[in-house]
């Protein structure tokens, strides 16, 4: 893979976005589950 300085920072940004998306999905599921159980 390249050592490009633009790509490097964008790759880190994409990883952060993926983690945020995953966490939002997990937390969203938990919230829906909690509402269902009430």
């Amino acid at each position: 893979h390249s050592d490009g300085i633009f790509t490097d920072s964008y790759s880190r940004y994409r990883k952060q976005m993926a983690v945020k998306k995953y966490l939002a999905a997990v937390l969203g599921k938990r919230y829906k589950q909690r509402v269902k159980n009430k």
Partner: antibody, heavy 118, light 110 residues
Amino acid sequence: EVQLVESGGGLVQPGGSLRLSCAASGFSLSSYAMIWVRQAPGKGLEWVGIIYDNGDTYYASSAKGRFTISRDNSKNTVYLQMNSLRAEDTAVYFCAREPGSTTQNDLWGQGTLVTVSS
Amino acid sequence: DVQMTQSPSTLSASVGDRVTITCQASENIYNSLLWYQQKPGKAPKLLIYRASTLASGVPSRFSGSGSGTEFTLTISSLQPDDFATYYCQNYYNIWTNGAAFGGGTKVEIK
């Protein structure tokens, strides 16, 4: 030899379209972010847009909605599609490879002149 | 988009002079700054990346400093080959900020 060669420039009427090509040799373009930069006659450098290694694109406000950057990895070429051209788009257009943090250098094409005039 | 302001726009100097060019970002870009040299009819050439790291093959008389919003390019002892135009460029979070260049500084013979 590692190089970038632009082509496709020329004279076009206002409102017209043009597609510029940037052919890479000596390295695989697919691993790099590539940018387009333009320079109006006697003026400074203006960033036009970027295409990342995964194909994501981002544009300067002056290019948004009119210009599209794409890549064909099989041809080792990046393109700049320019639509609804205006007189103020007259410039030399350069493509460039992003700088490397270990190679510590960048790579630019020689530029291609686009003239928008009736 | 982040705006980059360079000063001065023109600088008259003599061989051997110490030359300083400044670049100001409209917001914090940390150390995500490039400096280029361009000669008439040629493509730009990278001098410095990450605000202060010298690019490959660039003479040590060139140096960069600064972070945040204020940056400086210094040529410690101007050589005949250094008469050219210099540009700074932001590359912090290009996906939201863009990658604007400064307006350029032309270094000419006094």
